[in-house]
Interface confidence: low
Amino acid sequence: NQEQVSPLTLLKLGNQEPGGQTALKSPPGVCSRDPTPEQTHRLARAMMAFTADLFSLVAQTSTCPNLILSPLSVALALSHLALGAQNHTLQRLQQVLHAGSGPCLPHLLSRLCQDLGPGAFRLAARMYLQKGFPIKEDFLEQSEQLFGAKPVSLTGKQEDDLANINQWVKEATEGKIQEFLSGLPEDTVLLLLNAIHFQGFWRNKFDPSLTQRDSFHLDEQFTVPVEMMQARTYPLRWFLLEQPEIQVAHFPFKNNMSFVVLVPTHFEWNVSQVLANLSWDTLHPPLVWERPTKVRLPKLYLKHQMDLVATLSQLGLQELFQAPDLRGISEQSLVVSGVQHQSTLELSEVGVEAAAATSIAMSRMSLSSFSVNRPFLFFIFEDTTGLPLFVGSVRNPNPSAPRELKEQQDSPGNKDFLQSLKGFPRGDKLFGPDLKLVPPMEEDYPQFGSPK
């Protein structure tokens, strides 16, 4: 099937040396209301900022050619923790998540996630407790109520516990993550597992008969062969960001989801540089509407697992791993000993049939071209809430294939990619160094003018 993503975030909490301040208690019922549109919008922006922070750091420290993570999954795990966090620890969690919503962040996130992409989206969370460890009743109740995290006792037998956890993860991710944990530390007191399984279908499917072997340009010199999905008149929302220059396109899924791909037009880019000026607003301009576009998009299978302790520490959460105030969970001192995250992504042609009438109407409009044939970043957004569900980068979609040296005339300009810039301007320096959106202007590329 076409598009499947299974991220899983796990927080391991262990015993901490005693010490700390008096607990603060927030008034009951203060967070029980449904989020307002403004709160939802603010949260989407906050999540996008968190996504940029998190993914920039992950990409900086990773040597993998392809990355994928679910910021929503990580945020949910941290929000779950925030239910029992107090004082400075709670404050730090809110700062890192860019959420100035006080104690209501877990409630907001969990409430919004309940309505995410019906049918395509499955959220599962579970808590594993050390046998006999005293956890506060209030935390257990709220965990189950907000995150569906029914507490399960660890047996204390490592092999059994490991088998049980991995079996649950496998089921929760519908087989996409077979073996999440390879071991359990002796001092594990509390495991917070958060699994998200996503299966989307393109709103307009790709015709498998048009998929063919094509070149993906790794850099100015090398290509790798990929299976490239193609469409002649795909209804696509796209635009160009400048400084750095990036093509952006929104590929709609059924169930109010979007696959948003960002293709920098130059090879010399890094994730941090691209994300530095990227906000939710920048990726969601109003009034950029679908237009018929000749599209090429590689088939993908991505899988990535990482431990986020170092990354979250760099973001300002080192306290979690040293001496957090988690007395909302237990009066006994706790420390987070590990944060594991895994996602898998599969992109293929399957989708919903496009209505013939749409195709005919659109074929009368001017046609442009959008080719994803070089390194790119992507997001998966839930469109109703605006929440970023996944983020990833693809440097080499086929790392097992041998690299091929480009023919001389291909380098360095990559005529084929330049053709895909048809209608996109360059060199308009009206607006200084910030990231900006530019509407396509054919006079800048007369040789690539759209057919009328």
């Epitope: 549109p37 403004e38 919008h41 603010r42 922006r45 209804p235 929302r237 635009f239 960001l241 906000s279 607003d281 920048t282 990726l283 969601h284 301009p285 109003p286 009034l287 950029v288 509407w289 679908e290 237009r291 409009m365 001017s366 209608g423 607006f431 200084g432 910030d434 990231l435 900006k436 959106l437 530019v438 509407p439 396509p440 202007m441 054919e442 006079e443 759209s450």
Partner: antibody
């Protein structure tokens, strides 16, 4: 040089119809969203409607169901079909080009000189 | 009733500095949408004066500046001149209305 030239205004009775046109030149019309903004005599500016690059439309609540915005890219022309006109629709109607800015949101960078629509019996 | 609130009038003598405020809500200015300012000289179409809170299009003198904070924005005109006498409008995109919203306009008089 970017130019927008509105036409089609005039005197019309309440309940009547009118079609405004805005001829665009000096830029690639297909690649810009466009808006209609009106200004009643002695009053402030009021946004009426907008159309995106692919033909998607937005309307102010006050005109929803009565006005229709459209564009003909081959003629570089923006239209506003106004039906069931009311006295309160009396205004100078401007067409304006939507331009992206550095934050990812639009501003209306070029405006036409406007065409006067008077709804009166 | 305009969605964005501006004072109906403002005045100053030549050479003075005048500030015009614009207050919105969480669905427009407060939703991090940019604020734009337009100048309308008597009998003419509006002209873009400031875009994206504080950016000046080419040809607009640096006497004009803009700023934004929270759900409010302001336009400042320093070294006031007689040719600055005009109506000034703020505008922003509004999420809940899915459209542009304008302030009611401020009539600036140079005394």
């Amino acid at each position: 040089e970017v130019q927008l030239l509105e036409s089609g205004g005039g005197l019309v009775q309440p309940g009547g119809s009118l079609r405004l046109s805005c001829a665009a030149s000096g830029f690639t019309f297909d690649d810009y969203a466009m808006s209609w903004v009106r200004q009643a005599p002695g009053k402030g500016l009021e946004w009426v409607s907008a159309i995106g690059t692919g033909g998607g439309t937005y309307y102010a609540d006050s005109v929803k169901g009565r006005f229709t915005i459209s564009r003909d890219n081959s003629k570089n022309t923006l239209y506003l079909q106004m039906n069931s006109l009311r006295a309160e629709d009396t205004a100078v109607y401007y067409c304006a080009r939507e331009y992206y800015d550095s934050s990812g949101y639009y501003h209306l960078d070029y405006w036409g000189q406007g065409t006067l629509v008077t709804v009166s019996s | 009733q305009s969605v964005l609130t501006q004072p109906p009038s403002a005045s100053g003598t030549p050479g003075q500095r005048v500030t015009i405020s614009c207050t919105g809500s969480s669905s427009n200015i407060g939703a991090t949408y940019d604020v734009h300012w337009y100048q309308q000289l008597p009998g003419t179409a509006p002209k873009l004066l400031i875009y994206s809170n504080n950016q000046r299009p080419s040809g607009v003198p640096d006497r004009f500046s803009g700023s934004k904070s929270g759900t409010s924005a302001s336009l400042a005109i320093s070294g006031l001149r007689s040719e600055d006498e005009a109506d000034y409008y703020c505008a922003a995109w509004d999420d809940s209305l899915s459209g542009w919203v304008f302030g009611g306009g401020t009539k600036l008089t140079v005394l």
